[in-house]
Interface confidence: medium
Amino acid sequence: EVEKTACPSGKKAREIDESLIFYKKWELEACVDAALLATQMDRVNAIPFTYEQLDVLKHKLDELYPQGYPESVIQHLGYLFLKMSPEDIRKWNVTSLETLKALLEVNKGHEMSPQVATLIDRFVKGRGQLDKDTLDTLTAFYPGYLCSLSPEELSSVPPSSIWAVRPQDLDTCDPRQLDVLYPKARLAFQNMNGSEYFVKIQSFLGGAPTEDLKALSQQNVSMDLATFMKLRTDAVLPLTVAEVQKLLGPHVEGLKAEERHRPVRDWILRQRQDDLDTLGLGLQGGIPNGYLVLDLSMQEALS
């Protein structure tokens, strides 16, 4: 807290300008009118204030707007936004996409901070829905934001947003989310040629159906084991040994190290042992020769 002291004669600020950097903290508190500061917030970002001085300016705004800042002030906070706590931001009502963009720009290049997460939450609640413009903006700044959305929310993500997604941004996505994102990625990258397409689609393949994996196996893609291990088990099971061999290319040798883990373990159990033997990897656990394979799911469907 800054002590309340009278402003020295002749030091009353008539505008927010660079002369204020020469004011001590108590002078800023005493000589800068909070309403003037609120109307000239955009100027603060052009002036080399210290952290301590910025704290005083924030304190003045807090006193002026104890219930939360109006959007006209929020939009021009600039780097003062980084001084706000999540508790401050929870008092705001942010409805303008321009305001959201202005504040996300401040934090650009950094991980999503608690302030930004709270801001986004307030914005979405203020708007009442996650429209495409909002999602486009959020995924442009934080591609990883996709994985924090529910499958229902993801359904309104425009395929164009997928272009900004980096592989690491999908690390926290679960299979249900990838089920929604994969068709969008497939649409977004559909005009790319084989090898370029595979590079882009690779991180989304956790949502790919069997038929798409079969198609990829015909394109010499040489999928790495890390990607293969993230595929849906139900999509991998129907693949033949020959298809998996083509899909993985030289990486097929890695199956041996993963034979006890899903989806490789479950896939092995579905293959004929003599087919597995053709790989020459010593994979064990396949269906012995001469055994009849019953598809129980088909049997249940018929009964």
Epitope: N45, A46, I47, F49, T50, Y79, L82
Partner: nanobody
């Protein structure tokens, strides 16, 4: 972001020095910069500042003697100090505001001794 000041040293009263503050990182040209000084046993005080728009301002004690400037191509801000006085003796540091999501970066400082 790193700030490296240089150019300090021992100078006689009435002499001149040119301090430099080199900043690593991009977006230098759109940020506000300032020089501060701290004399032994005193609080740090601003000496000269330049806004992101390029306007400059000086402490009354150095007006007409000190000049702040910048070279965006070199990511460097300068402080030309003329007619130096013993009371200008201090550690001079630059502050480089609002780069990459931070408010301010301070350099380690360069010592100016007028004696």
């Amino acid at each position: 972001v790193q700030l490296v000041e240089s150019g300090g040293g021992l100078v006689q009263p009435g002499g001149s020095l040119r301090l430099s503050c080199a900043a690593s990182g991009s977006m230098f040209s759109i940020n506000a910069v300032a020089w501060y000084r701290q004399a032994p046993g005193e609080q740090r005080e601003p000496v000269a500042a330049m806004t992101s728009g390029g306007s400059t301002i000086y402490a009354d004690s150095v007006k007409g003697r000190f000049t702040i400037s910048r070279d965006n191509a070199k990511n460097t801000v300068y402080l030309q100090m003329n007619s130096l006085k013993p009371e200008d003796t201090a550690m001079y540091s630059c502050i480089y505001c609002r780069y990459d999501g931070e408010f301010a970066y301070w350099g380690q400082g360069t010592l100016v001794t007028v004696s």
